[in-house]
């Protein structure tokens, strides 16, 4: 009997661990603004908090910028960045403005990059206004495996809204890969 | 035998809550157009419907306007937000608007209010053009603890799309706080 | 004794189905580029990949330009469309542009498509710059039915960004009905 | 080699008027924000007046607000400066400037022109 | 508007000594936009140092700026003998743009 029911209880661990009683992984990172880099040309964010507010990380890690995945798996990512321009702030170079986001996924085994997925959009920005908004969302579904980093890139960074509301990026397991 | 299969058992509906075989919380919530606030000033929107149309809720409550929290867990919350004004309607007392979303977390332990997520735009809806519309959407990722409230607020509430389609904020859980 | 293991064995086959070890279906479609309709009236989307690069299907069903749902369920559905144009690629028709996505469900028990989501803006693009672009996201959480079917319907497809990390839909499904 | 060369000062009585214009070579003008920026004999910079590439937006000091007017003509390479009321205290070497184009907003200075003189006397 | 405040007013060196040059905001500098330029007599101011710290195309790097938030440092390591100048600094973070008064670096 007690052989039989190890035989069952091993089955049942088994089962438990397949049905995702291991806790499934997430990121929700929210931007540091301590550090946003200037200018207007397209670069990476690399300074994103993970542990204070809305901000929080479990079985994934942040380093070097970049939000790196330990478990294989499907993922939906997503990301919400957000313009903003206020005249005290700063006269407007140009009214011509291209606000956009690029959440780009690296594998270290093969290094390359490539964007998952973009938004955002061309915008003018008149002088005669003396504040200016924009938000972007993007989100979609990929494979993730282990060891792949998950990055934002953003034109114009100098304009971000450094509220922890306005800019943020995350990702949440949604299901093994069969 | 009997007393190690009830052991097996108990193990088993142990299991099976802890699967989540339990329903998972879930609200989808679209927008009351007989009820929609009028001005341009930020408001809190409190007239939604859940039950018709896609509208819909499970393991969770919807009163006073507010979304609440009946499961701890993590949560995927969004809104889409959608402004159209058309000439018929009458001229615009402003061509330059702010178009903006707020999903407000309250706890009602602590009674305060933050903004989870924030989107939008500011628009120049010139008379040139008979008609205007724009959408905004947000989503992101939250522990949410039973009790707590999720609400929306708007600018421009009287531009709001009353379809269904349009003006809509949800919430599904998607994992246990560990 | 292997009677009660059977009947134990039974309930855990029973709970493994139930508790999704079944594959969840899913499903992230990018626009194929070679196929897209001219024009700038609203029309349905035909065209996507389903099997290259980012995009990937599984427990759904890709058919005449459709995503069929093959299993009941809740689902979070999402669309990412972007447009844009470049001066080289020749005058707009008009500068005032309606740029809209609607994702819809269709079913064919009883033939009717009702709008799930819509979302987009007006446009001003302005001769004075060179490149306009323009995102739009939607999303949100449905009751799906097996058959039921998702198409996407835009608004000027001739300035659709052809790119798959720009102009994509998904599905996942998140939970069973009850 | 990027070359601002700036004319059109003078001398000229208080509530007069005058145009400075700035000449602009060697980069694709239209595609800079450009300013002005003064100095007053023996004293410190103050800046005055900003233009966007396109010419749709123009800022200025508080000091000129409603007094003068930056222009800009792309296709001449040339940026303007329109000063009506003239008062002593304009008085100064007034600089046309470029803007690095590398920042969203109009940021540092970078090069300047020699300098024209604005004298507002009686 | 933000008030840049240089001191000293005046700075008596010998060439070949340090010089340290200090430029102070009425408010926080946001993301560090900061400028210094060097002006001649008879002549245009010539930019040095923006971002605070980010050297322009072809200053030497005697030249060597640091700071943040409302405390800003020109340093010039070794003086040579065509550095003497009046220096200026610039702010570009919040509009106005506003200089500081200047300072004076003359020889001893």
């Known amino acids: 009997i007690r052989a039989e029911k190890a035989m069952v209880d091993g089955s049942w661990l088994d089962l438990a661990k397949r049905s995702k009683l291991e806790a499934q992984p997430f990121a929700h990172l929210t931007i540091n603004a301590t550090d946003i880099p200037t200018g207007s040309h397209k670069v990476s964010l690399s300074s994103w908090y993970h542990d204070r507010g809305w901000a929080k990380i479990s079985n994934m890690t942040f380093s070097n910028g970049k939000l790196i995945v330990n478990q294989d798996g499907f993922y939906y990512l997503y990301a919400n960045i957000c313009f903003r321009h206020h005249e005290t702030s700063g006269d407007l170079a140009t009214e011509y403005l291209q606000l956009m986001v690029y959440v780009t996924k690296t594998s270290i085994k093969i290094p390359s990059s490539h964007t998952l997925m973009k938004g955002g959009s061309t915008k003018y920005w008149s002088g005669n206004s003396e504040f200016h908004f924009y938000s972007i969302n993007v989100g979609g579904f990929f494979k993730l495996r282990s060891g792949e980093e998950i990055s934002v890139e953003v034109s114009n960074p100098s304009l971000l809204d450094p509220d922890q509301d306005a800019t943020y990026f995350g990702a949440f397991k949604v299901r093994d890969i069969d | 035998i009997r007393a190690e299969k009830a052991m097996v058992d108990g193990s088993w509906l142990d299991l099976a809550k802890r699967s989540k075989l339990e329903a998972q919380p879930f609200a989808h919530l679209t927008i009351n157009a007989t009820d929609i606030p009028t001005g341009s000033h930020k408001v809190s929107l409190s007239s939604w419907y859940h039950d018709r149309g896609w509208a819909k809720i499970s393991n969770m409550t919807f009163s006073n306007g507010k979304l609440i929290v009946n499961q701890d867990g993590f949560y995927y919350l969004y809104a889409n937000i959608c402004f159209r004004h058309h000439e018929t309607s009458g001229d615009l007392a402003t061509e330059y608007l702010q178009l903006m979303v707020y999903v407000t977390k309250t706890s009602i332990k602590i009674p305060s209010s933050h903004t989870l997520m924030k989107g939008g735009s500011t628009k120049y809806w010139s008379g040139n053009s008979e008609f205007h519309f724009y959408s905004i959407n947000v989503g992101g990722f939250f522990k949410l603890r039973s009790g707590e409230e999720i609400s929306v607020e708007v600018s421009n509430p009287s531009l709001l799309d009353p379809d269904q389609d349009a003006t809509y904020f949800g919430a599904f859980k998607v994992r246990d706080i560990d | 004794i292997r009677a009660e293991k059977a009947m134990v064995d039974g309930s855990w086959l029973d709970l493994a189905k139930r508790s999704k070890l079944e594959a969840q279906p899913f499903a992230h479609l990018t626009i194929n580029a070679t196929d897209i309709p001219t024009g700038s009236h609203k029309v349905s989307l035909s065209s996507w990949y389903h099997d290259r690069g980012w995009a990937k299907i599984s427990n759904m069903t890709f058919s005449n330009g459709k995503l069929i749902v093959n299993q009941d369920g809740f689902y979070y559905l999402y669309a990412n469309i972007c447009f844009r144009h470049h001066e080289t690629s020749g005058d707009l028709a008009t500068e005032y542009l309606q740029l809209m996505v609607y994702v819809t469900k269709t079913s064919i028990k009883i033939p009717s498509s009702h709008t799930l989501m819509k979302g987009g803006s007006t446009k001003y693009w302005s001769g004075n710059s060179e490149f306009h672009f323009y995102s739009i996201n939607v999303g949100g959480f449905f009751k799906l039915r097996s058959g039921e079917e998702i198409s996407v319907e835009v608004s000027n497809p001739s300035l659709l960004d052809p790119d798959q990390d720009a102009t994509y839909f998904g599905a996942f499904k998140v939970r069973d009905i009850d | 080699e990027v070359q601002l060369l700036e004319s059109g000062g003078g001398l000229v009585q208080p509530g007069g008027s005058l145009r400075l214009s700035c000449a602009a070579s060697?980069?694709?003008?239209?595609?800079?924000?450009m300013s002005w920026v003064r100095q007053a004999p023996g004293k410190g910079l103050e800046w005055v007046s900003g233009i966007t590439g396109s010419g749709g937006s123009t800022y200025y000091a508080d000091s000129v607000k409603g007094r003068f007017t930056i222009s800009r003509d792309n296709s001449k390479n040339t940026l303007y400066l329109q000063m009506n009321s003239l008062r002593a205290e304009d008085t100064a070497v007034y600089y046309c400037?470029?803007?690095?184009?590398?920042?969203?907003?109009?940021?540092?200075?970078?090069?300047w022109g020699q300098g024209t003189l604005v004298t507002v006397s009686s | 508007e933000i008030v840049l405040t240089q001191s000293p007013g005046t700075l008596s060196l010998s060439p070949g000594e340090r010089a340290t040059l200090s430029c102070r905001a009425s408010?926080?500098?946001?993301?560090?936009?900061l400028a210094w330029y060097q002006q001649k007599p008879g002549q245009a101011p010539r930019l040095l140092i923006y971002?605070?710290?980010s050297r322009a195309t072809g200053i030497p790097d005697r030249f060597s700026g640091s700071g943040s938030g409302t405390d800003f440092t020109l340093t010039i390591s070794r003086l040579e003998p065509e550095d003497f100048a009046v220096f200026y600094c610039?702010?570009?973070?919040?509009?106005?743009?506003?200089f500081g008064q200047g300072t004076k670096v003359e020889i001893k």
């Open positions: 610039q702010q570009y973070g919040s509009s106005p743009r506003t």
């Open positions: 400037a470029k803007d690095p184009g590398t920042t969203v907003i109009m940021s540092w200075f970078d090069p």
């Open positions: 971002g605070a710290s």
């Open positions: 060697g980069f694709t003008f239209s595609s800079y924000a």
């Open positions: 408010q926080s500098v946001r993301g560090r936009y």
